[in-house]
């Protein structure tokens, strides 16, 4: 209970250039305390200086990675200080160019089933790390499989639940700098599907229409659907729209299409605010067609 | 279940002390450090310290310094506080408070004993 | 505060200085101890309703009930544990029309 609890916030994880705050947190609420750093550049700033409560350190550069642990004052100890606290990695990003984050076979993941995260870059990373927003542990390392045109790291993830939904992120690093990462990936969102029933999708004026036609495509169910999500197969991202209560007792969204030229085959989904990476079974597929053009799909 | 009984309700005269008990059970007694709050109409609630079940260490608000012993017995998984030289400032009902655990650091107080009342009257 | 069981409420707490998110939220319904319903600003403790959310960070904070039930009749308090001596707000009392 001596033993104070060093944490950074908003994360380990920090863009160079910005700033991340240590803190230090004693369970008996002594509110000063000291920082050192083990391993890495030294960082002048933390040498015989104590801290109340919590130190915003940055702007971070290269030199801040590294890691970190805090004493806390402590009038009962003979030294006056506590033990050493845990220790608090902090990874500095922006370091490298962004690798790739991509999933096969696709980001949108049946409950229960499994997902490959394949993060690769041009550059020889023999580390990557595995990011989920919002979440404050440390992410997970993985190794690289090193070839002439690069790096890649295959990572298989599953049984798919909602509470491995989410935002993901990887980042580069070579071995000799561990914690020195590269401008992280742009963002994959991984979505588990099939955890509600499915909505009902249907089209007005109806699924065939003339080039340049305007079509409205509706999703609705019985279900307290916040959100419904419209995507066309074979393409990447979907259309996204808050649902409607309407007289006849269903949750309904309604995506304006404008004027079509060319048809596909579209699925909606449906979700809850609450959890948002976390959607219904998809709908039917409804495939709108589109005439007086040579391309249906 | 994690209960936190604490001793009756105290009636005494200006000028003496009054130790309060409570029992922790149904947890590990000494793995959640105790903390101990005052609730009085005057100053709503008041944070008067903590203190390591584990070994006894203490912190105090200063304005409870001189006013608020806090001591444990951990082979009855008991926190005691004594309160010293009693006012009718020093009436109120007094809580003890085990910290919430869970996730590496201890954070707020998330069980509550039912509070002992403390009247001083002459 | 007065409301309708139904209404939408919500109650902000402002510190002095920045305490991060070390933030917690109380409800103490008469004659009771108080209970722990949020802590660093928008962790929900275990088996509290959803209806009961909190946000914010730095020095301004908000606790909101979506949807109120006569339950919900009680002193709500702030208190925050980034600096000791821990100080609690005042209290803000939930009446039910």
């Known amino acids: 209970q001596d033993k104070p609890f060093l944490s950074a916030w908003p994360g380990t994880v920090v863009s160079e250039g910005q700033h991340v705050t240590l803190q230090c947190r004693s369970r008996l609420g002594f509110n000063e305390f000291s920082l050192s750093k083990e391993d890495g550049m030294p960082v002048p700033e933390l040498y015989n200086r104590i801290f109340r409560n919590s130190f915003l350190m940055g702007p971070v550069t290269p030199a801040h990675a590294g890691t970190y642990r805090c004493c806390s004052s402590h009038p009962h100890s003979p030294t006056g200080w506590s033990a050493p606290s845990n220790p608090v990695v902090i990874m500095v990003t922006g370091v490298h160019r962004k690798p790739s984050l991509l999933a096969h076979p696709g980001p949108l993941v049946k409950s229960g089933e499994t997902v490959i995260l394949q993060c690769w870059s041009d550059v020889r990373f023999e580390r990557f790390l595995l990011h989920r927003e919002g979440i404050t542990e440390d992410p997970l390392r993985l190794v690289g499989q090193l070839h002439d045109a690069g790096s890649q790291v295959n990572y298989s993830m599953g049984p798919m639940t909602p509470a491995l939904a989410g935002t993901y992120r990887c980042f580069g690093s070579v071995t000799h700098l561990p914690y020195e990462l590269s401008a992280p990936s742009d963002p994959l969102d991984i979505v588990v599907v099939g955890l509600y029933g499915k909505p009902s999708l249907s089209a007005q004026p109806g699924p065939t229409v003339q080039a340049g036609e305007n079509v409205t495509l509706s999703c609705s169910s019985r279900s307290l659907f916040d959100i419904y999500h419209l995507s066309r197969e074979a393409e990447a991202g979907e259309l996204r729209l808050t649902a409607v209560l309407r007289v006849n007792g269903t949750f309904q969204a309604n995506f304006p299409l404008g004027p079509v030229t060319h048809g596909g085959n579209y699925r909606c989904f449906g979700s809850f605010r609450a959890l948002p990476h976390a959607w219904s079974d998809p709908s039917d597929p409804l495939p709108v067609s589109v005439t007086g053009n040579s391309r249906h799909l | 279940q994690v209960q936190l009984q604490q001793s009756g309700p105290e009636v005494v005269r200006p000028g003496v002390s009054v130790k309060i008990s409570c029992k922790g059970s149904?947890?590990?007694?000494?793995?959640?450090?105790m903390h101990w709050v005052k609730q009085s109409h005057a100053k709503s609630l008041e944070w008067i310290g903590v203190i390591s079940t584990y070994n006894g260490n203490t912190n105090y608000n200063q304005n409870f310094e001189g006013k608020a012993t806090m001591t444990v017995d951990k082979s009855s998984s008991t926190a005691y506080m004594e309160l010293a030289r009693l006012t009718s400032e020093d009436s109120a009902i007094y809580y003890c408070?085990?910290?919430?655990?869970?996730?590496?650091?201890?954070?707020?107080?998330?069980?509550w004993g039912q509070g002992t009342s403390v009247t001083v009257s002459s | 505060l007065l409301v309708s069981a139904g209404d939408r409420v919500t109650i902000t707490c402002k510190a002095s200085q920045s305490v991060i998110n070390d933030v917690a939220w109380y409800q103490q319904k008469p004659g009771q101890s108080p209970k722990l319903l949020i802590y660093?600003?928008?962790n929900r403790y275990t088996g509290v309703p959803d209806r009961f959310t909190g946000s914010g960070y730095g020095t301004d904070f908000t606790f909101t009930i979506s949807t109120v039930q006569a339950e919900d009749l009680a002193v709500y308090f702030c208190q925050q544990d980034y600096s000791s001596p821990y100080t609690f707000g005042g209290g803000t009392k939930l009446e039910i029309k």
């Open positions: 408070a085990r910290e919430r655990g869970g996730d590496g650091y201890y954070s707020a107080v998330d069980y």
């Open positions: 149904g947890y590990t007694f000494t793995d959640y450090t």
């Open positions: 660093y600003a928008s």
